[in-house]
């Protein structure tokens, strides 16, 4: 689950960011890959590695310096120091701690000018969290009688998640029991005999299959659930693609 901030490529990648010098084409520094600089705010779990990049060009080849909170960033400013890979215009900090939080500015300069770019680093200390479900999933679906449909529930959980697919059902023509609670049927759940519990596939559907389908996910910390609706159309009607996805926001984190 370890994630590193900045782009994920290794410093052994083949994309060389150096621009060769040409005396007749002198030029102030410029950014060569702004896509790698778009993400300014980096929230990273403690103990992870952070890499900030400022790919630049210029003639003569510019130099790169790093500032922390507007001041020169020295090796002794953090335990374990940091690495600068000049050929990749990168700053690498391993095993970040809360004191590493702050603004990191790359200052790229040559005799014709200078440019700078600032990243903000937030070091997040980890706490156990309940499952997080991807917004918009499962998505509403429609199909004709006899058709097939698939609902997908994307789950993120550090701890082992238990996934259940639940549908509201009727008993003796009633949706609710004497206690006022709805009648629910577990259609599928994660376990030994269940393959890919994040997907609920329905085949050869009938009108009876129409209704609300709930993806309920629990771990030892708590629960989350989201639902989607299945519309079953008569055979002669073509399915209408749902434009709006309705997701219960109750458990979104």
């Amino acid at each position: 689950d370890a994630i590193s901030s900045g782009d994920d490529e290794d410093d052994t990648d083949s994309s060389e960011d150096f621009v060769s010098e040409n005396r007749s084409n002198q030029r102030a520094p410029y950014w060569t890959n702004t896509e790698k600089m778009e993400k300014r705010l980096h929230a990273v779990p403690a103990a992870n590695t952070v890499k900030f990049r400022c790919p630049a060009g210029g003639n003569p080849t510019p130099t790169m310096r790093w500032l922390k909170n507007g001041k020169e960033f020295k090796q002794e400013h953090r335990i374990g120091g940091y690495k600068v890979r000049n050929q990749h215009w990168s700053l690498i900090m391993e095993s970040v701690v809360p004191s590493d939080k702050g603004n990191y500015t790359c200052l790229v300069e040559n005799e014709y000018g200078s440019i700078n770019h600032t990243y903000h680093l937030d070091v997040v200390e980890r706490s156990p969290h309940r499952p997080i479900l991807q917004a918009g999933l499962p998505a509403n679906a429609s199909t004709v009688v006899g058709g097939d449909v698939e609902f997908v529930c994307k789950v993120y959980s550090d701890a082992q998640p238990h996934i259940q697919w639940i549908k509201h059902v009727e008993k003796n023509g009633s949706k609710y029991g004497p206690d006022g609670l709805p009648y629910l049927k577990v259609l599928k759940h994660s376990g030994i005999n269940s393959s890919n519990a994040e997907v609920l596939a329905l085949f050869n559907v009938t009108e009876m299959d129409a209704g609300e389908y709930i993806c309920k996910v629990s771990n030892y910390i708590g629960q989350a659930n989201q639902s989607a609706w299945l519309t079953v159309l008569p055979k002669q009607q073509a399915p209408v693609r749902e434009k709006e996805i309705t997701a219960s926001p109750d458990y979104l984190e």
Epitope: D1, S127, P128, H129, R130, D158, A159, Q160, S218, N219, Y220, I221, G222, Q223
Partner: antibody, heavy 114, light 107 residues
């Protein structure tokens, strides 16, 4: 800040019941499981069960199934653990703990003695 | 139920020592293991969860590793305040079982 405050010590007779409360504050009570764990004198930790207050879903250690009942009152952000048919072996400190076992109550000593 | 077998049950070490406690699960629990510290008369404190994630505010001398059935908890440099009993716990499936504990003493 997150706090779990448990009810006071109890002395009970064998065969009777005890109900321990755990009042939560400083976080959204309904968003996390509430676990109950006990520790007999000089012994290790034993998980009793848990409740998800939002919908009342419970999970129990089979060892306590039928004797332990865990409930939650959303209006007061309080969880309860009731243990019936008490015997001397139930003498222990009973703890409530938030979902990730990251916050614990101070413990409630239950003594079962004739 | 998943059994958690912790060893040793007690150990004596000097300040500054590296201390290692192990826990073995009776079945694969992936990385769903937590470690707690408990001092006499106090509630347990969460140190490590999901096998290797150090909980907020826990000193960096405490670390955890392992997956599957074998797990290790390490104190890199023992401090006087680390004298306590340490427990492992699996949070893979209910019931969430604990190891029997390791009592750590200063030599």
């Amino acid at each position: 800040q997150v706090q779990l405050v448990q009810s006071g010590a109890e002395v009970k007779k064998p065969g009777s019941s005890v109900k321990v409360s755990c009042k939560a504050s400083g976080y959204t009570f309904t968003s996390y499981n509430m676990h109950w764990v006990r520790q007999a004198p000089g012994q290790g930790l034993e998980w009793i069960g848990a409740i998800f207050p939002e919908n009342g879903d419970t999970s129990y250690n089979q060892k306590f199934k039928g004797r332990a009942t865990i409930t939650a009152d959303k209006s007061t952000s309080t969880a309860y653990m009731e243990l019936s048919s008490l015997r001397s072996e139930d003498t222990a400190v009973y703890y409530c703990a938030r979902g990730g076992f990251d916050y614990w109550g101070q413990g409630t000593t239950v003594t079962v003695s004739s | 139920d998943i059994q958690m077998t912790q060893s040793p049950s007690s150990l004596s070490a000097s300040v500054g020592d590296r201390v290692t406690i192990t826990c073995k699960a009776s079945q694969d629990v992936s990385t769903n293991v937590a470690w707690y510290q408990q001092k006499p008369g106090k509630a347990p404190k969460l140190l490590i969860f999901s096998a290797s994630y150090r909980y907020t505010g826990v000193p960096s001398r405490f670390s955890g590793s392992g997956s599957g059935t074998d797990f290790t908890f390490t104190i890199s440099s023992l401090q006087p305040e680390d004298i306590a009993t340490y427990y492992c716990q699996q949070h893979y499936s209910s019931p969430y079982t604990f190891g029997q504990g390791t009592k750590l003493e200063i030599k």
